[in-house]
């Protein structure tokens, strides 16, 4: 009988194409249950039905059909806690990173029809159910409204709202992007009695104005109150209104702690502790002092009390308070003590237990690694994530601490579940953590699973990306390595993406992808098939990502190294890494490039202009070019103020423009969207002007009416095609 001809698997596989990336052919799915009780959740199915699941009875049924969704073109939904109503969201219209407006319809599940009468106005800026029953709070034209029931007339809570001037219940631009990272600034108390909200007064903030070309005869001008470094900031006030009788008392203002109110300050977050206790966090404009203030409702005077002995101060002596943001407290069942992540005496972020004062805090975790997020505190357990396991900063595992035990015992829930496939997890917990979902992002194919909150046993696989696994079978994927390199007393973690038939004895072009912003992390054990995967797979380019000083989760000494001197060590460490990669022997020294977006565009620009001759070419997409052009909250957190008596000198020294002459010996591609609300086009305009003034040749591309993400399909295609051509030309790779 004839023997079968053996074909090595490698020959049957194809390389990735740019088209694969642009079409999202190899995108993965995750599954996050929308928890509605201890053992029940909702999920939107592939065909857009909203399905109810009960883990214990194993029942599942369609709670809202796709035809009902389709009848109002709904793309999202929200079930009221009493399960009588669902809001349907349609006409989604993106504003900034988190914010959008939409049209909302209320569907009555009992009688199977939409609620008529007192329909909601449109477009609404934010809408949410109360945590109990079916009260609705929403923001329309910068004012907050309340409905006791969906069919009731609305009660207007605030009257001060004014476009681009005063925002109630929603953040202004800078708070949305740099402080809250949400589209909302209102919070219901757990029993739905009180509603807390923030008023942002932007009346004195300078306006950034840019053209939006559209397709009309005249462009329109977008105006955004946007405080750049050193400018006037929003004035914030926090109010609480009793929603049972909102007309009787009116919103009450919550006082700012005196030590904060004595100079410019920020509100940073609000956490309801119980139905009559609330916790507010405040931050000085010089962001090294944060105050957590616990306030109680007093029935006798119907007033909010924030006693001084319930103020807890967190201060950094080596940099700024917190990580990227100041952490939020996770309160115990006693509604008095809480768990919080902040730096320990060795400068590593760890979980601390605060009972009375921060000085008497009990450290719960410790070591030369960092606790990253507290997911849930229950009667007997605390669930958190960290990068402790095996000493890899770019991993995330979920741990459980049994707080009932003395001393508390720690268990890694995820470390050994699917060790090769999964090293980077997040979690989603049901009420009281009776059940939880784990979502693994890599390094292998992402997988989502359901677990018992008592035993940690896996109950069910929710999504394992089987289709993706099958479609990747015939693809030549690059090899990914995560390792560390040492230089002097410093350790830098890097990720290297190697072409499929990588041979150490050969020479390859190298592309450095950089972000490098303070408290960011690029070297993560996650799965991705993206542009750089394609460059390695098809074009034979070695890609490297390096986490230099200023990046996160490796202690404050490493993190705070960049404090008040952005643009120095981030660049230096990329250069150090490139030299180390050259020493490895497989890099073609004549073909090294660097690229980055946003903060990465800033670092790539400075690296190209470092005068080292290491780079042949590079790309900066939407780069910051001067910290004076960027948002106050961000710039000042890391750089202080651009004033003579503070840090003006380094603000001036750290610009890309100051290094214009040094671009003469590199090929530079500068790219920016003209409607970038975040890193304004101004940044690239100033780089271009400085290069022209210095008579330095460079390439540039703008994307009309595109924002910081350059997200429109056509623009993305053009952008990545353009960058690919540029790189291939730089590396002398044939088309």
């Amino acid at each position: 009988r004839p023997s079968r001809v053996y074909k090595p698997e490698g020959n049957t596989k194809r390389a990735l194409t740019l088209k694969d990336i642009l079409n999202g052919t190899f995108s993965y799915k995750t599954y996050f249950p929308n928890w509605i009780s201890e053992q029940e959740y909702l999920h939107q199915s592939e065909d857009d039905n909203i399905v109810f699941y009960n883990i214990e009875t194993r029942e599942s049924y369609i709670i809202l059909s796709n035809s009902t969704m389709k009848s109002v073109n709904a793309t999202d939904y929200g079930l009221s806690p009493d399960r009588q109503f669902v809001y349907l969201e349609s006409d989604y219209s993106k504003l900034w990173r988190y914010s959008y407006t939409a049209t909302y319809y209320i569907y009555d599940l009992q009688n199977g029809e939409f609620v008529r009468g007192y329909e909601l106005p449109r477009p609404i800026q934010y809408l949410c159910w109360s945590p109990v029953g079916s009260k609705l709070a929403y923001v329309y034209q910068n004012n907050i409204y309340l409905k006791q029931r969906p069919g009731d007339p609305p009660f207007q809570i605030t009257y001060t709202g004014r476009e681009n001037r005063i925002f109630n219940g929603i953040p202004d631009w800078v708070y949305e992007e740099e402080m809250l990272a949400t589209k909302y600034a209102l919070w219901w108390s757990p029993d739905g009695k009180f509603l807390a909200y923030v008023e942002f007064n932007d009346s004195d903030i300078p306006i950034i104005a840019y053209s939006y070309y559209g397709d009309g005869q005249y462009p329109r001008t977008i105006n955004i109150p946007y405080p750049k470094a050193g400018a006037k900031n929003p004035v914030v006030r926090v109010f609480i209104v009793d929603t049972t009788y909102p007309h009787h008392v009116g919103p009450m203002e919550v006082p700012v702690p005196e030590m904060i109110a004595s100079s410019d300050y920020y509100f940073s977050w609000l956490t309801w502790v119980s139905s009559e206790r609330v916790c507010l966090q405040w931050l000085k404009r010089v962001q090294n002092v944060s105050v957590l203030s616990i306030c109680d409702f007093r029935e006798d005077w119907h007033a909010w009390e924030c006693p001084k002995n319930q103020e807890h101060v967190e201060e950094s002596r080596t940099g700024w308070a917190g990580g990227f943001f100041v952490s939020t407290p996770a309160f115990s069942q006693d509604a008095t003590s809480y768990y919080k992540i902040f730096s320990d005496k060795d400068g590593y972020k760890h979980i601390h237990y605060i009972k009375d004062t921060v000085e008497n805090a009990i450290q719960i975790t410790s070591g030369k690694w960092e606790a990253i997020y507290i997911f849930r505190v229950t009667q007997d357990s605390l669930f958190y994530s960290s990068n402790e396991f095996e000493g890899y900063p770019g991993r995330r595992n979920i741990y459980r601490i049994s707080i009932g035990n003395s001393p508390p015992s720690k268990k890694c829930v995820t470390c050994h579940l699917r060790k090769e496939r999964c090293q980077y997890y997040t979690a989603s917990f049901s009420y009281k953590a009776k059940y939880y979902a784990l979502v693994c992002y890599g390094p292998g194919l992402p997988i989502s699973t359901l677990h018992d909150g008592r035993t940690d046993q896996e109950i069910q696989v929710l999504e394992e990306n089987k289709e993706l696994e099958n479609s990747l079978r015939n693809i030549q994927l690059p090899k990914v390595e995560i390792k560390k390199l040492k230089d002097g007393g410093l350790t830098f973690w890097y990720k290297m993406i190697l072409p499929p038939q990588f041979d150490r004895s050969k020479k390859y072009p190298l592309l450095i992808q950089v972000y490098g912003g303070p408290c960011s992390q690029s070297v993560k054990s996650v799965f991705a098939v993206n542009w750089i995967t394609y460059l390695a797979s098809k074009e034979g380019i070695v890609i490297a990502l390096v986490d230099g000083r200023g990046t996160a989760f490796q202690g404050d000494k490493f993190l705070h190294a960049v404090y008040r001197k952005l643009g120095v060590y981030e660049v230096e460490d990329q250069l150090t890494a490139v030299r180390k990669f050259i020493e490895m022997g497989f890099i073609d020294e004549e073909r090294i490039a660097i690229w980055g977006w946003s903060y990465g565009g800033y670092v790539s620009s400075l690296a190209l202009a470092s005068g080292t001759g290491l780079f042949k070419c590079g790309i900066a997409v939407a780069p910051v070019s001067s910290w004076e052009y960027y948002a106050s909250i961000y710039s000042e957190r890391f750089m202080g103020l651009p004033t003579k008596d503070d840090n003006l000198e380094h603000y001036k020294n750290s610009t890309v423009m100051a290094r214009a002459e040094y671009f003469r010996n590199v090929d530079y591609l500068l790219i920016h969207g003209t409607a970038d609300d975040n890193v304004h086009f101004q940044n690239s305009a100033q780089i271009a002007k400085a290069l022209v003034n210095a008579q330095v040749d460079f390439q540039a591309m703008w994307y009309s009416d595109q924002n910081h993400g350059i997200l429109s399909g056509r623009s993305q295609n053009h952008l990545y095609t353009h960058m690919t051509h540029f790189l291939k030309q730089c590396f002398s790779l044939s088309d």
């Epitope: 008392v249 009116g250 009450m252 203002e253 919550v254 005196e258 005077w301 007033a303 924030c306």
Partner: nanobody, 121 residues
Framework: EVQLVESGGGLVQPGGSLRLSCAAS??????????IGWVRRAPGKEEELVAR????????RYADSVKGRFTISCDTSKNTAYLQMNSLRAEDTAVYYC????????????WGQGTTVTVSS
Amino acid sequence: EVQLVESGGGLVQPGGSLRLSCAASGFNIKDSSTYIGWVRRAPGKEEELVARIQCSSGSTRYADSVKGRFTISCDTSKNTAYLQMNSLRAEDTAVYYCAGRQSYNYGYIYWGQGTTVTVSS
């Protein structure tokens, strides 16, 4: 030193009106940490907080017994709070005290010396 000084009390017929004033010194009534209240004491009756205001927000609260008849307000430029009393009844007769409470030190109440209101025909 914090001081609250009331004025405006007196004798008035049922159905009449009076306006009580409370001038504050030693703290700022427009601070969000400050609440000003009017408390009345009458022989044989329990002390009653008839109205309170947080001047920073304008949030007010009234005892059911005076709702719709009394209005509490403040003039932050004068650092003074007022109680406008309309449709007065015999049962409104009492000594009216201005009280100040600060959120940071809630348990402590600053008191004025009191002003007497007598409603009688």
